[in-house]
Amino acid sequence: IWELKKDVYVVELDWYPDAPGEMVVLTCDTPEEDGITWTLDQSSEVLGSGKTLTIQVKEFGDAGQYTCHKGGEVLSHSLLLLHKKEDGIWSTDILKDQKEPKNKTFLRCEAKNYSGRFTCWWLTTISTDLTFSVKSSRGSSDPQGVTCGAATLSAERVRGDNKEYEYSVECQEDSACPAAEESLPIEVMVDAVHKLKYENYTSSFFIRDIIKPDPPKNLQLKPLKNSRQVEVSWEYPDTWSTPHSYFSLTFCVQVQGKSKREKKDRVFTDKTSATVICRKNASISVRAQDRYYSSSWSEWASVPCS
Amino acid sequence: RNLPVATPDPGMFPCLHHSQNLLRAVSNMLQKARQTLEFYPCTSEEIDHEDITKDKTSTVEACLPLELTKNESCLNSRETSFITNGSCLASRKTSFMMALCLSSIYEDLKMYQVEFKTMNAKLLMDPKRQIFLDQNMLAVIDELMQALNFNSETVPQKSSLEEPDFYKTKIKLCILLHAFRIRAVTIDRVMSYLNAS
């Protein structure tokens, strides 16, 4: 058993049929010595008396808010949560496996630039009685500070019969140099509590590996005389690291109809303009990627050909 | 200890092309190592990230773009003195800081070159003959060093009398290649910045 936060404790249980469970001793936070009784949750049934209560925690029915009272007055609470371990593996029931970039990816993180700011998100089908708490650091043995905000519900989607909820959090490395060469990864730890179930999820990455620029901005078209060709120009996204001559991007320019199966024109360039062949009912799209370290491409920025 | 906006002569900054080739070569070599050594811990997640130039050179700091010198987090206290001549310095107006930066890059390349050559000598003794260093990568390091054209003491190639541990050597190769790729990215950024200045 360990303390998650004040008056909240996590009991780690090996989860299998007829498991013995864990013996837990609760102590009432009071100078009082006698006349103390214990109850669980909203029940008025007295579980025991005395300053300490010893319980055998085996299942979720044994978890919950234990309260010690004296003469009708509440003295203190202890909330017990369960963390299940099945076949030596901690449970991952609360969050959905996003399977990208690989299986068992519960947390996904992205950074728009090298400033040390990044966003992580996760998915769940659970809608109520759910709380998250996020901590982060650079490195684990001698951790350097990363400050994370509160996790918030950022999107709701319908997937078949299920509703899916996306939560996200923004974090900022306390003293980040955009030009630095990372040798210690960022560690992100998410504590998830659903009702009386506790789970924790972690992700470890270098900012350079989670870079995904914003789409290029200000796409403009200029038809070329006596030609099917169009000159398309754009600018670096505002959120990208500066100076741009140091943090350079490369671009992919594509002309395509509405269907992915349609024919297309595609060209790659390090410049902020390109010449492509425009077709009726097609769109010109441009996306960006770090020129020197191939992490993710940005989303497409698009304009219609006409 | 940063790069002011220098004004090299018109035309291609001589080292940009070489630095692009360097990044390509080390990326290809790293990809080859990952594929060939698939049963060794050779991915970014699996290896320890070590920098053999740590406390010996200060390329990131010496080559910091002017725009980042206002960022306190970028101003490391490490100071290193370097020799200040070099053929990539295409203009007389080139500052002392730029010379410091380029000479730090040269020292990086020299250290990696020695490490890679020592390692290759060991890998050539491996009866499995599983992996060797790409001669193209070694040639590209050499070309960039020549383009930088700094005079400095030659570092003797390390020779080891004991029987090499090929497993450890291959893991060290992965560690070196990952670190060198990151440094090659920095070098490419620096050359691109200087070329644009």
Partner: antibody, heavy 118, light 107 residues
């Protein structure tokens, strides 16, 4: 299986014209760009131009502009390349090639040898 | 027009040995570079597109690398069927242009 089948070899006199055909099978004809590329004996490949069979849009290499005409007949899934004012240096194997991507070629015809000789 | 220069023009190789063919563009073309193989009396065949992207059905011993002006086609271990002429082609701008070709011959 996508295939491009070209018309047979031709012998032409200088100053005349030649029209080579390229019939496509497999896949929808208008879903692909169609190009013509030639190769003189022992020489490198030389791109001549492309057509979008969907709308008849064409683009030609400046070297052949005014001398080459590329057309397409959607009803027969056939593209044509006509080269006029032939000279001896136009002796070459003419290939049609196609792709959903405009700028490179993933399926090629077998080639048509055009010999220009007096 | 962008001029593509291949080297060497002729490359004698022992079967089983690796081979590398270089292609240089007269100006930067990013990764807009494609490789083809041509055997005598046959049409070219696409091997690699956009500098390094492999084509399904093409053996994995063929790989491409490069960007900007310098590109390389590598055959990791030459098989008897690989003796042919190889062409690079740029698609950065029209007109599309090819290299002169590199003939890989049996040593």
């Amino acid at each position: 299986q996508v295939q491009l089948v070209q018309s047979g070899a031709e012998v032409k006199k200088p100053g005349s014209s030649v029209k080579v055909s390229c019939k496509a099978s497999g896949g929808t004809f208008s879903d692909y760009y169609l190009h013509w590329v030639r190769q003189a004996p022992g020489q490198q490949l030389e791109w001549m131009g492309w057509i979008d069979p969907e709308n008849g849009d064409t683009e030609y290499a400046p070297k052949f502009q005014g001398r080459v005409t590329i057309t397409a007949d959607e009803s027969t899934s056939t593209a044509y390349m006509e080269l006029s004012s032939l000279r001896s240096e136009d002796t070459a194997v003419y290939y049609c090639a196609r792709n959903k991507e405009l700028r490179y070629f993933d399926v090629w015809g077998q080639g048509t040898l055009v010999t220009v000789s007096s | 027009d962008i001029v593509m220069t291949q080297s060497p023009l002729s490359l004698p190789v022992t079967p089983g040995e690796p081979a590398s063919i270089s292609c240089r563009a007269s100006q930067s073309i990013s990764i807009n570079l494609h490789w083809y193989q041509q055997k005598p009396g046959q049409a070219p065949r696409l091997l690699i597109y956009f500098a390094s992207q492999s084509i399904s059905g093409v053996p994995s011993r063929f790989s491409g690398s490069g960007s900007g002006t310098d590109f390389t086609l590598t055959i990791s271990s030459l098989q008897p069927e690989d003796f042919a002429t190889y062409y690079c082609q740029q698609s950065n701008s029209f007109p599309l242009t090819f290299g002169q070709g590199t003939k890989v011959e049996i040593k």
